[in-house]
């Protein structure tokens, strides 16, 4: 098992300047580590590519809400 304490931290140094279509997004994770220069959200797209985004932007918050709801909704 990897040592979580020593696991490498992905930091965001720039944020995307684009609003990403929510249909292209699969998941997200928050970056809050003190080792990073700024708080961020990293979206993972449906083709497993990662994008740094600014958690203060409304579209980012809306996208996280949408993904949260998708996760909570059971597949029938």
């Amino acid at each position: 098992q990897p040592d979580a304490i020593n696991a490498p931290v992905t930091c965001c140094y720039n944020f995307t300047n684009r609003k990403i279509s929510v249909q292209r997004l699969a998941s997200y994770r928050r970056i809050t580590s003190s080792k990073c220069p700024k708080e961020a959200v990293i979206f993972k797209t449906i083709v497993a590519k990662e994008i740094c985004a600014d958690p203060k932007q409304k579209w980012v918050q809306d996208s996280m809400d949408h993904l949260d709801k998708q996760t909570q909704t059971p597949k029938t």
């Epitope: 720039n14 995307t16 684009r18 279509s21 249909q23 292209r24 990293i42 590519k49 994008i51």
Partner: antibody, heavy 122, light 107 residues
């Protein structure tokens, strides 16, 4: 099949105009930024312009600003490049490309058209 | 505009060789760098994005590294189908720019 099919190239006189088209299929065109890139014969690649998903935001390289216009029609899954006041130095193969966001920046290309040759000559 | 300088402009190598291509940026581009392979008469093909991420479907013999100003593309064991021209591209800022390319030829 995910692809970009280009049309509209050809021979045009200096000062003339031409419109290039790029038809997308196999993916949801309206979810992506799109770009045009060109390559002069035997030379490197030059990014020209890109356009946001709904067409509201556009960026151009200085060498074509004011002469070329990028546009799109999401209902037709099509991207366009209107080229006016053409010069001999615009002679190149023109590629359309799907334009993605990276971890620390925006604008690399994971899907390309096959290219169309534009020759500007009298 | 950010200028990208690729070196060497061309190189000769044999099948099985380890090949290292260099792309130097005139100013910081973080890890916003991509590498493409282009064969004559064809469109470029994406190999690497975010400086070191391998595009889906690209053989693992290709790898990228660096975080500016120097980036490298390494081909661990050159295959016959790898003889082509390779371009780097920065997407840190507009205008998006490409390097001049490195042509990998058969020795």
């Amino acid at each position: 099949e995910v692809q970009l099919v280009q049309s509209g190239g050809g021979l045009v006189q200096p000062g003339g105009s031409l419109r290039l088209s790029c038809a997308a299929s196999g993916f949801t065109f309206s979810h992506y930024w799109m770009s045009w890139v060109r390559q002069a014969p035997g030379k490197g690649l030059e990014w020209l312009a890109n356009i946001e998903q709904d067409g509201s935001e556009k960026y151009y390289v200085d060498s074509v600003k004011g002469r070329f216009t990028i546009s799109r029609d999401n209902a037709k899954n099509s991207l366009y490049l209107q080229m006016n006041s053409l010069r001999a130095e615009d002679t190149a193969v023109y590629f359309c490309a799907r334009d993605l966001e990276g971890l620390h920046g925006d604008g690399y290309f994971d899907l390309w058209g096959r290219g169309t040759l534009v020759t500007v000559s009298s | 505009a950010i200028q990208l300088t690729q070196s060497p402009s061309s190189l000769s190598a044999s099948v099985g060789d380890r090949v290292i291509l260099i792309c130097r940026a005139s100013q910081g581009v973080s890890s916003a760098l991509a590498w493409y392979q282009q064969k004559p008469g064809k469109a470029p093909k994406l190999l690497i994005y975010d400086a070191s991420s391998l595009e889906s479907g690209v053989p693992s013999r290709f790898s990228g590294s660096g975080s500016g100003p120097d980036f490298t593309l390494t081909i661990s064991s050159l295959q016959p189908e790898d003889f082509a021209t390779y371009f780097c591209q920065q997407f840190n800022s507009y205008p998006l720019t490409f390097g001049g390319g490195t042509k990998v030829e058969i020795k």
